[in-house]
Interface confidence: low
């Protein structure tokens, strides 16, 4: 069975459990030739697009979305989608961002490293959004 555009992956640096006020960067990855990466929240209720795409490897491109100061409102599920002209890819798996109060205790780790959601072999749903709505008040480089 031929594949369509490969599914993107999403990861978070330094992790998915982020102390209040700290920063987090979502990393979306897809094939080479991607024109636009989109980071979506909660079933496309809000999203951010970037054309600042870099080549991560000979066969992979990536975009980074940074939130400088995480608030409780940033918690929730995130996923990536990309546009490789003239088509949109499927969505990545969801990645859940958790925001925790800073207790300052030495035993409480700041982050949960190595968290990512990669492509699956046969996704059950291909969502295709040819005419996506305009970015809903989000700044070009930051979600909030």
């Amino acid at each position: 069975q031929e594949e369509d555009l490969p599914r993107p992956s999403i990861s978070a640096e330094p992790g998915t459990v982020i102390p209040l006020g700290s920063h987090v960067t979502f990393v979306c990855r897809g094939p080479v030739g991607v024109q636009t990466f989109r980071l979506e929240r909660e079933s496309r209720s809000t999203y951010n697009d970037t054309e600042d795409v870099s080549q991560a490897s000979p066969s992979e491109s990536e975009a980074r979305f940074r939130i400088d100061s995480v608030s409780e409102g940033n918690a929730g599920p995130y996923r990536c989608i990309y546009y490789k002209p003239p088509k949109w890819s499927e969505q990545s798996d969801y990645l859940e961002l958790l925001v925790k109060e800073t207790s300052g205790g030495p035993d409480s780790p700041d982050t949960e490293p190595g968290s990512s959601a990669g492509p699956t072999q046969r996704p059950s749903d291909n969502s295709h959004n040819e005419h996506a709505p305009a970015s809903q008040g989000l700044k070009a480089e930051h979600l909030y």
Epitope: Q1, E2, D4, P86, K87, N126, H128
Partner: antibody, heavy 122, light 107 residues
Framework: EVQLQQSGPEVLKPGASVKISCKAS?????????MNWVKQSHGKSLEWIGY????????SYNQKFKGKATLTVDKSSSTAYMELRSLTSEDSAVYYC??????????????WGQGTSVTVSS | DVQMIQSPSSLSASLGDIVTMTCQAS??????LNWFQQKPGKAPKLLIY???NLEDGVPSRFSGSRYGTDFTLTISSLEDEDMATYFC?????????FGGGTKLEIK
């Protein structure tokens, strides 16, 4: 074997509408494929009308054919349709459906229907 | 829209000749170019995709190349069955656009 079987020739009067069908077989209609429609006027080149994504019905049209062509699918019968409305002599042409396959990171119109001739004459 | 300027519009060649035809894109840096062969009364048949990739089952005498926005289809040794019209298609930018065609005749 992948096959796209189109409906037969049509002779219509100006102002009429017509719905052309394209029945797909030999592959999973709703898997990762788009269906394109292409117009070829007599002795002329090819014009892309638009595509439809059978999985969810999403469409994209050439601006030139917006309001003229409407693309739909019936997933249960693996059939794509193109309706042309308000026909004029300019719409007389052969219309093809063509599947968008995906090979080695490239989209390709790899399989084509045999074409449906539409003649508009008073 | 991206215009695809195809030349020549017709050409005549002898069996065994090397034949070339070109398509020039009006814009676009990373175009996925397809070449098709069409015989009278038949649907187009895919020959080349991605500018230079040969479709399965297509004879190896057909090849495609790209230099910037110029794309070339070459038939290395013309055979009788190659008499047809050839079209290019840019399959990257919406709307997709075809070249005007090159009608190839055998001398």
């Amino acid at each position: 074997e992948v096959q796209l079987q189109q409906s037969g020739p049509e002779v219509l009067k100006p102002g009429a509408s017509v719905k052309i069908s394209c029945k797909a077989s030999g592959y999973t209609f709703t898997d990762y494929y788009y269906m394109n429609w292409v117009k070829q006027s007599h002795g002329k080149s090819l014009e892309w009308i638009g595509y439809i994504y059978p999985n969810n019905g999403a469409t994209s049209y050439n601006q030139k054919f917006k309001g003229k062509a409407t693309l739909t699918v019936d997933k249960s019968s693996s059939t794509a349709y193109m309706e042309l409305r308000s026909l004029t002599s300019e719409d007389s042409a052969v219309y093809y459906c063509a599947r968008d396959g995906y090979s080695s990171n490239y989209y390709t119109m790899d399989y084509w229907g045999q074409g449906t001739s539409v003649t508009v004459s008073s | 829209d991206v215009q695809m300027i195809q030349s020549p519009s017709s050409l005549s060649a002898s069996l065994g000749d090397i034949v070339t035809m070109t398509c020039q894109a009006s814009q676009g840096t990373s175009i996925n170019l397809n070449w098709f062969q069409q015989k009278p009364g038949k649907a187009p048949k895919l020959l080349i995709y991605g500018a230079s990739n040969l479709e399965d089952g297509v004879p190896s005498r057909f090849s495609g190349s790209r230099y910037g926005t110029d794309f070339t289809l070459t038939i290395s040794s013309l055979e009788d069955e190659d008499m047809a019209t050839y079209f290019c298609l840019q399959h990257t930018y919406l709307p997709y656009t075809f070249g005007g065609g090159t009608k190839l005749e055998i001398k």
